[in-house]
Interface confidence: medium
């Protein structure tokens, strides 16, 4: 049975900036073809046929859901991709993670632009702090590493906040044992 | 009250180790990074390291490192600095500090441990 | 990284105003708004005088103020008392979570 394909994002935010560039790859088992895939943004068919799909200069309007379809296979699970307009912004590696898998958080500043004395917090509770920007990373989640995350930091002299960023930490499918 | 407070003094002779410790009290300890500055007598202070208790994050002086050791221990929200072998020139008052991120700054200090090591 | 540069001492008449001086480069003073102030008065731990350059905390006199142009930092204490004979030393951050102090300057109050 031919696997669903699957949406990957580089670089993994699926929040970024206005004006930003991100691309979207569609990977699947098998899948030489070029010319062969099928887009689909807020289940609109993009002309895009090619396995990525590159968003340059993002804008509002390139927010929403994401699938692809490699030939006549099943669509894709969806991907969601939000452009913001704001001084900082959380971005997640993912916002619903598996027990055991990483978890990365980026408190990003628009333009790229210096944010220091940048400062983490889940659930209202400050978590570590830099005074240069750097990311979270967690190793392995677990389902108490669950709630709303933001950040805030300091951009040309001045304190900003992000917006809040809920993230999902989700117990990993029991594993069937067989008696042989 | 916020306050962190010290070991005592201490005596060494050279060559021995040391470990010296800084007792946090009055705050989430796990949530401030905790930096270690040293005074040699009728000198001026050198900052050592630091640590981040929620998960013993450390970072060195470029002249302190490979010299000491900085560690934590979350769960009785102390830090420490340790030596392996003692010299004489590692006489001095050690002082603990916390690091505020609100002000960038070192707000609260221990009282300091004196070390003496001599033969 | 090398010790913030200030003057080793400094002196003044109670009721003058001095500023001390702290000079460091453009990768710690020059380059992040961190610069803080501590008082060390004799066989006590240092207290904490200006942070982020010039801002004092609660409980501070308003006679200490902190300034910063280029890599220098200055403190400046106005209206000079008896009490302010003391150690005074700035401190930078300098990137990587390291920090850097001055070399201390040592106030009289004559």
């Known amino acids: 049975v031919p696997q669903k394909p699957k949406v990957s994002l580089n670089p993994p935010w699926n929040r970024i900036f206005k004006g930003e560039n991100v691309t979207l790859t569609c990977n699947g088992n098998n899948f030489f073809e070029v010319s062969s895939t099928k887009w689909f943004h807020n289940g609109s068919l993009s002309e895009e046929t090619n396995s990525s799909l590159n968003i340059v200069n993002a804008k509002f309007e390139d927010s929403g859901e994401y699938k692809c379809q490699h030939q006549q296979v099943n669509e894709s699970e969806p991907v969601y991709l939000e452009v913001f307009s704001d001084w900082l912004l959380l971005q997640a590696s993912a916002e619903v993670v598996m027990e055991g898998q990483p978890l990365f958080l980026r408190c990003h500043g628009w333009r790229n632009w210096d944010v220091y004395k940048v400062i983490y917090y889940k659930d209202g509770e400050a978590l570590k702090y830099w005074y240069e920007n750097h990311n979270i990373s967690i190793t392995n989640a677990t389902v108490e590493d669950s709630g709303t995350y933001y950040c805030t930091g300091k951009v040309w002299q001045l304190d900003y906040e992000s917006e809040p960023l809920n993230i999902t930490v989700i117990k990993a499918p029991r594993e069937k044992y067989w008696l042989q | 009250e916020v306050q962190l407070v010290q070991s005592g003094a201490e005596v060494k002779k050279p060559g021995e180790s040391l470990k010296i410790s800084c007792k946090g009290s009055g705050y989430t300890f796990t949530k401030y990074w905790i930096g270690w500055v040293r005074q040699m007598p009728g000198k001026g202070l050198e900052w050592m390291g630091i640590i981040y208790p929620g998960d013993s994050d450390t970072t060195y002086s470029p002249s302190f490192q490979g010299q000491v050791t900085i560690s934590a221990d979350k769960s009785i929200s102390t830090a420490y600095l340790q030596w392996s072998s003692l010299k004489a020139s590692d006489t001095a008052m050690y002082y603990c500090?916390?690091?505020?991120?609100?002000?960038?700054?070192?707000?609260?200090w221990g009282q300091g441990t004196m070390v003496t090591v001599s033969s | 990284q090398s010790a913030l540069t200030q003057p080793a001492s400094m002196s003044g008449f109670p009721g003058q105003s001095i500023t001390i001086s702290c000079t460091g480069t453009?990768?710690?003073?020059?380059?992040?708004?961190?610069v803080s102030w501590y008082q060390q008065q004799p066989a006590k731990a240092p207290k904490l005088l200006i942070y982020?350059?010039?801002k004092r905390p609660s409980g501070v006199s308003s006679r200490f103020s902190g300034s910063k142009s280029g890599s220098t930092a200055s403190l400046t204490i106005s209206g000079l008392q008896t009490e302010d004979e003391a150690d005074y030393y700035c401190?930078?951050?300098?990137?990587?979570?390291?920090?850097?102090f001055g070399t201390g300057t040592k106030v009289t109050v004559l």
């Open positions: 982020e350059d010039n």
């Open positions: 453009r990768d710690d003073v020059g380059n992040y708004d961190l």
């Open positions: 401190c930078s951050y300098a990137g990587d979570y390291t920090y850097v």
């Open positions: 500090a916390k690091d505020n991120p609100f002000t960038g700054s070192f707000d609260i």
